[in-house]
């Protein structure tokens, strides 16, 4: 058999600074099994070095000196007896860039440098970023383990140092943030914030970092109801809104959460399976009615829980007045005034702009009030005839406004015809 020296190794390999690379390699050399069996030694040298004197970059020969700058970083991987010359390069440095050749030695007969198959190593600037691993989604209040690792890095070389930064880490002690792993208990306010892992090789200038935006899943913590862009005050899960009867109303309910909660509006205080009157955070009423005193509920439904706020509508109305109207009856002149308002209004009668309060001590007039449904009625009885033309007014008022009406009573009962007083409003 013809003696053959062969080496199979890639011509060039590129690795980023601080990372590792494995260069597969196999070789063959002439060897007869009936020869004596001296040990097989293999070496990797820097190109241009003289094998007899030079320090090697990697070898399996314990008696050969290894270059201090590659010690522990360049290693032979695999079984050389099986003709495996694979080279592992760790914590690559810029100064490692260059050509390397492989040499085999066994006894006196086998001493060969494979100069035709050199390995060209190029170390480039580090652009690889670390990976931050954690189980998604992050859930508010649930501790989660995060780890930071650099693809392509290995144990070779000085140890890596880590530092974590981000708003979500504020309560952690500094030691915790210097490990490749940390346990984070995210809060709702951490959603959307940045978390950065920075890696550095001790004693080297090589640093790299990765920033991730935290996606924290959290149930709604609060509900806000807006009217015309203004938030309503909420006390004990209830909001109070005074609103004018007959007015159109558009309300917006907002409940920050992630993923967004499903918002809906219900009549009154609903059961859990009630039918919504709006399947969004928007409630539109073409007008508010007195019947709306029952109020509405905004519910925010979320996979992590639900929240609801009751909106208590306090419906108010300005006094609406019917009257006064007057007629002659047996006991004297009888005037009536009807009014409707929320809250219930006060009412007073005036005769020639002079207030008539209660019942007169002389018995010249009498006031009676009653209410039925939304309407209240008041009556004024004036005893005796009219000495001159008189103006009778009634006025209703509440905290939101007032309304008044008046009639002009013309002198002389005979003028009144069918008994209805001619009115000049």
């Amino acid at each position: 058999e013809k003696p053959v020296y062969e080496l199979q190794v890639q011509k060039s390999v590129t690795v980023q600074e601080g990372l590792c690379v494995l260069v597969p390699c196999s070789f063959s050399y002439p060897w007869r099994s009936w020869y004596s069996s001296p040990p097989l030694y293999v070496y990797w040298f820097r190109d241009g070095e003289i094998p007899y004197y030079a320090e090697v970059v990697a070898t399996n020969n314990p008696d050969r000196r290894v270059k201090p700058e590659t010690q522990g970083r360049f290693r032979l991987l695999g079984d050389v007896q099986k003709k495996n010359c694979s080279l592992s390069i760790g914590d690559a440095r810029m100064e490692d860039t260059g050509s390397y050749f492989f040499r085999v030695e066994r006894g006196r007969d086998v001493k060969y440098s494979y100069q035709q198959n050199k390995l060209n190593l190029e170390v480039t600037a580090l652009i690889e970023k670390p990976d931050i691993h954690f189980l998604e989604p992050l859930e508010s209040g649930r501790p989660t383990r995060l780890s930071c690792s650099l693809p392509g890095s290995c144990e070779a070389g000085p140890p890596l140092t880590f530092s974590w930064t981000g708003n979500a880490l504020s309560p952690l002690d500094p030691e915790t943030t210097r490990s490749s792993e940390l346990t984070l208990t995210p809060r709702p306010e951490d959603h959307g914030t940045n978390l950065t892992c920075q890696m550095k090789r001790q004693g080297a200038q090589v640093t790299t970092e990765r920033t991730v935006q935290l996606n924290v899943s959290y149930a709604p913590q609060t509900i806000t109801i807006f009217r015309n862009g203004i938030a309503l005050e909420i006390l004990q899960n209830t909001s109070y809104l005074p609103v004018l009867e007959g007015q159109a109303l558009r309300l917006l309910c907002d409940a920050p959460s992630n993923p967004p909660a499903h918002l809906s509006w219900f009549q009154g205080s609903p059961a859990l399976n009630a039918t919504p009157i709006s399947n969004t955070g928007i409630l539109e009423l073409r007008r508010v009615r007195s019947a709306e005193e029952g109020g509405f509920t905004c519910r925010a439904q979320h996979p992590l829980g639900f929240l609801q706020i009751f909106l208590n509508l306090s419906v108010y109305s300005l006094p609406q007045l019917l009257g006064p109207s007057c007629s002659w009856e047996a006991e004297g002149l009888h005037c009536r005034c009807s009014f409707r308002a929320r809250p219930a209004p006060s009412l007073c009668w005036r005769l020639e702009e002079k207030p008539l309060e209660g019942n007169s001590s002389q018995g010249s007039f009498k006031v009676n009030s009653s209410s039925a449904g939304p309407w209240a009625n008041s009556s004024l009885i004036l005893h005796g005839g009219l000495s001159s033309d008189l103006k009778v007014s009634c006025k209703a008022w509440n905290i939101y406004g007032s309304q008044s009406g008046s009639v002009l009573l013309l002198q002389g009962r005979s003028n009144l015809g069918t008994g209805v007083v001619p009115a000049a409003l």
Epitope: G246, W265, Q267, T275, P276, I277, S278, N279, T280, I282, L283, E284, L285, R286, R287, R289, S290, A291
Partner: antibody
């Protein structure tokens, strides 16, 4: 419980007018729109229009704009529909109906009157 | 105007059977502001006024038996009677109240087989 009571059947001559009434009870009359619907014999339903007793607002189906006039009398909680220039095509059952919740300008018909049969015949 | 197309125009089924009827609208009845579907179903028994069964496409009116179910969204809707009873003999109408003029389907008549 809301209840709508309509006036009785009418037999009218072509060219004449008729006024159908619908008396509401069991709820606050001004809080809900009253709708009117036509159903010709053996046919489907046709929306005529609505009257809003709160503010007097109306909305008509264009097909009935010149045929129907909607009014109400708030004091008696009664809605009216007057049909004019009647022809045989107007022979039908006419229903009044009340909307559901009264929140929206567009709602379903939750309560129906019993219907008034108007027959136009010479 | 929105056109409401109901099918079939009539169907025959035995008491106890499941009955399904369809209603298609010529445009979507989903109102984006409140994400509610503006469709109702009515039942009209012979000689009677229509009666509300379903509103907002799937909300059963109070007092309506739970054998009546409304479903669908957008433009395609279905009324299902899970186990039809003799008293359900009627014409069923779908109704869009999404935009004026309000319109009704031509009806589906259920007859006993």
């Amino acid at each position: 419980q809301a209840y709508l009571q309509q006036s009785g059947p009418e037999l009218v001559k072509p060219g004449a007018s008729v006024k159908v009434s619908c008396k509401a009870s069991g709820y606050s009359f001004t809080d809900y729109n009253i709708y009117w619907v036509k159903q010709s014999h053996g046919k489907s339903l046709e929306w005529i229009g609505y009257f809003d007793p709160y503010n007097g607002g109306t909305n008509y189906n264009q097909r009935f704009k010149d045929k129907a006039t909607l009014t109400v009398d708030k004091s008696s909680s009664t809605a009216f529909m007057q049909l004019n220039s009647l022809t045989s095509e107007d022979s039908a059952v006419y229903y009044c109906a009340r909307e559901g919740y009264g929140y929206d300008d567009r709602e379903w018909f939750a309560y129906w009157g019993q219907g008034t049969l108007v027959t136009v015949s010479a | 105007d929105i056109v409401m197309t109901q099918s079939p125009s009539s169907l025959a089924a035995s008491v106890g059977e499941k009955v399904t009827m369809s209603c298609k609208s010529s445009q979507s009845l989903l109102y984006s502001t409140n994400q509610m579907t503006y469709l109702a179903w009515y039942q009209q028994k012979p000689g009677q006024s229509p009666k509300l069964l379903i509103f907002w496409a799937s909300t059963r009116e109070s007092g309506v038996p739970d054998r009546f179910t409304g479903s669908g969204s957008g433009t395609d809707f279905t009324l299902t009677i899970s186990s039809v009873k003799a008293e359900d003999l009627a014409v069923y109408y779908c109704h869009q109240f999404y935009s004026y003029p309000f319109t009704f389907g031509s009806g589906t008549r259920w007859e006993i087989k």
